[in-house]
């Protein structure tokens, strides 16, 4: 799946209206200087691919973000504005049910959420450049 056919304006609106607030709430108590993230994405579909990677897949210090409010809203937004996206998620939902539930220590995930904020900001910037 690639994100080429998504409605980027609608995704941007959803991000600014809700997802961004949830990400910032998750990061509350940390300073922007706490994490030295140089994240980048080259265009809008690529930014969404990177966002998908870091929102719904484990990394070494953060086992899962999928149950967080911003992740649920991200999934809903992509399902709504990216044709065919929902079909890619069926196996993932089934796989998640089989997996053992693991408690996630929030502060271990802060760096990853900081990366996500950077990617979303890049997404908005690439959108502004096109207009």
């Amino acid at each position: 799946y690639d994100f080429t056919n998504c409605d980027f304006q609608k995704i941007e609106a959803d991000y600014l209206r809700t997802i961004s607030k949830d990400l910032i709430t998750y990061m509350s108590g940390t300073k922007s200087t706490d994490f030295n993230n140089t994240v980048s994405c080259s265009n809008r579909p690529h930014c969404l691919t990177e966002i998908q990677s870091l929102t719904f897949n484990p990394t070494p210090r953060c086992a899962s973000l999928a149950k967080e409010m911003f992740a649920r809203k991200t999934k809903a937004t992509l399902a709504l504005w990216c044709p065919g996206y929902s079909e890619t998620q069926i196996n993932a939902t089934q796989a998640m049910k089989k997996r053992r539930k693991r408690k996630v220590t929030t502060n271990k995930c802060l760096e990853q959420v900081s990366q996500l904020l950077g990617l979303w900001r890049r997404f908005i910037r690439t959108l502004l450049k096109k207009q």
Epitope: T49, E50, S53, L54, T88, A92
Partner: nanobody, 117 residues
Framework: EVQLVESGGGLVQAGESLRLSCAAS????????LYWYRQAAGIERELIAS???????NYVDSVKGRFTISRDNAENTMYLQMNSLKAEDTGVYYC???????????WGQGTLVTVSS
Amino acid sequence: EVQLVESGGGLVQAGESLRLSCAASGSGFGVNILYWYRQAAGIERELIASITSGGITNYVDSVKGRFTISRDNAENTMYLQMNSLKAEDTGVYYCASRNIFDGTTEWGQGTLVTVSS
């Protein structure tokens, strides 16, 4: 489906360096999130490094600053540069490729790294 083959393991002295490679064949490598796992004797397999299609990296604390994960999407290859190796880095290193949408994961067969002190 992606097939993965690791190489580059071996026996080194503490403080030395090694570079592991993970060559992929098949489709899907480009957008998948890629991982290096380590399994030491008697210990559960541990995720130590990850890299997204665009090169965003994350590391477990114990290897941060010593190990560097990278990927070459044109060559369908991932690397793990391991510097300042310690005895506790000994183990079998596995590469893995995970579909970012449905979570299906392909594994390599592993390569043994032994660090003697």
